[in-house]
């Protein structure tokens, strides 16, 4: 039994980290593999995670963590039974997925405006709650030509739109993810999408 | 009541050995990291050894190293102290003291908060 | 190793006074935002030692708040506020960042 690809962990920098990698062959991770995690602070204990199948031979692992700080750094060993298949660190700080936002909302009875909200996927006292910034994706369920992003650079988790910027009479879609800048993330999954039907009045015409 | 009581001190002669034990009581004993001091007559304190709550990771000062064993007995709540090869600088008072919450991810660490009366060892020939 | 350096070494106090202990460390004790691992201990004429200060400056359960502590990196401070009679005996910093903890050379308060 081989590693053919190394585990690869991504934080989101609260409480789970997630290890994925490739075996050489089909293999029932959980009953197969284990992996050992410690940090790297006097008087730690190793904890042991017990990997998932992700695919035939793909094995993915959630960490569970207490929280996390920039120095922090963990020991990584990869286990089949008594034999050590691999050994690594891996520095949440440095390798950061933002959760994703939640409860996208789009509120449609603001005037001729559309009022996009969600809710910051970390709570007050973590260091991302200030930091994140976010993408707002909306498509039209009718034309996938019809699609845009929109940046929201700053911390307010909201987008105001003009619902005359989208067609009137159809049906659209949004969902948001986040990034922050401060750690170089990647950017976090998707939220669920929300849908709505888009109708404003059209301006009368002046002859 | 959170209580640490030493035992095992004495007097021994140099190259000999004793072996300390810290019985604790009132608290989950596995749960954290327990640590050795020391104090020569008319000295400052010295830290000699730490042990992780599981026993899984033990740490030594470099004047005990090779000679000393730090252990521990989770089902009878109770630290040891194997001093071997004894010398006259190992004369001293011998505290246990509690150290941080080790079972967690990240330890939780308030301080040495409680610690045994000390049991004094005597190396003389 | 780290090495903490105390001063002063002898502290004479009137009752009633405030007192300040201070305590340099070789290296940084900051492990994250607040947490610098430093302790402040007292220890009594024929006693233990006794936890009055964890993590630079969190009073210790049953600590009177007349004990203070302050500082963060390598810089740090115990106040007395005001001086007790029962306040007397060697204060000691200690680290515990790193294996092997380290304690400062021990400040001997004594009543003027």
């Known amino acids: 039994m081989k590693v053919l690809q190394e585990p690869t962990c991504v934080s989101d920098y609260m409480s789970i980290s997630t290890c994925e990698w490739k075996m050489n062959g089909p293999t029932n991770c959980s009953t197969e593999l284990r992996l050992l995690y410690q940090l790297v602070f006097l008087l730690s204990e190793a904890h042991t995670c017990i990997p998932e199948n992700n695919g035939g031979a793909g094995c993915v692992c959630h960490l569970l963590m207490d929280d996390v700080v920039s120095a922090d750094n963990y020991t990584l060993d990869l286990w089949a039974g008594q034999q050590l298949l691999w050994k690594g660190s891996f520095k949440p700080s440095e390798h950061v997925k933002p959760r994703a936002p939640g409860n996208l909302t789009v509120h449609t009875n603001v005037s001729d405006t559309l009022l996009l909200t969600w809710s910051n996927p970390y709570p007050p006292d973590n260091y991302l709650y200030n930091h994140l910034t976010y993408a707002v994706n909306i498509w039209s369920e009718n034309d996938p030509a019809d699609f845009r992003i929109y940046n929201v650079t700053y911390l307010e988790p909201s987008l105001r739109i003009a619902a005359s910027t989208l067609k009137s009479g159809i049906s659209y879609r949004a969902r948001v993810r986040a990034w922050a800048q401060c750690y170089n993330t990647t950017w976090s999954e998707w939220s669920p999408s929300t849908k709505w039907h888009n109708s404003y009045r059209e301006p009368f015409e002046q002859h | 009541e959170v209580q640490l009581v030493e035992s095992g001190g004495g007097l021994e002669q140099p190259g000999g050995s004793l072996r300390l034990s810290c019985a604790g009581s009132g608290f989950t004993f596995r749960t954290y990291a327990m640590t050795w001091v020391r104090q020569a007559p008319g000295k400052g304190l010295e830290w000699v050894s730490s042990?992780?709550?599981?026993?899984?990771?033990?740490y030594y000062a470099d004047s005990v190293k090779g000679r000393f064993t730090i252990s521990r007995d989770n089902s009878k709540n109770t630290l040891y102290l194997q001093m071997n090869s004894l010398r006259a600088e190992d004369t001293a008072v011998y505290y246990c003291?509690?150290?941080?919450?080790?079972?967690?991810?990240?330890?939780?660490?308030?301080?040495?908060?409680?610690w045994g009366q000390g049991t004094t060892v005597t190396v003389s020939s | 190793d780290i090495v903490m350096t105390q001063s002063p070494l002898s502290l004479p106090v009137t009752p009633g006074e405030p007192a300040s202990i201070s305590c340099t460390s070789s290296q940084s004790l900051l492990y994250s935002i607040g947490k610098n691992y430093v302790d402040w201990y007292l220890q009594k004429s024929g006693q233990s030692p006794q936890l009055l200060i964890y993590e630079g400056n969190n009073r210790a359960t049953g600590v009177p708040d007349r004990f203070s502590g302050s500082g963060s990196g390598t810089d740090f401070t115990l106040k007395i506020s005001r001086v007790e009679a029962e306040d007397v005996g060697f204060y000691y910093c200690?680290?515990?960042?790193?294996?092997?903890?380290?304690f400062g050379q021990g400040t001997k308060l004594e009543i003027k």
């Open positions: 200690m680290q515990s960042l790193t294996s092997p903890y380290t």
């Open positions: 003291a509690k150290d941080r919450v080790s079972i967690t991810i990240r330890p939780r660490y308030y301080g040495l908060d409680v």
């Open positions: 042990i992780s709550g599981s026993g899984g990771n033990t």
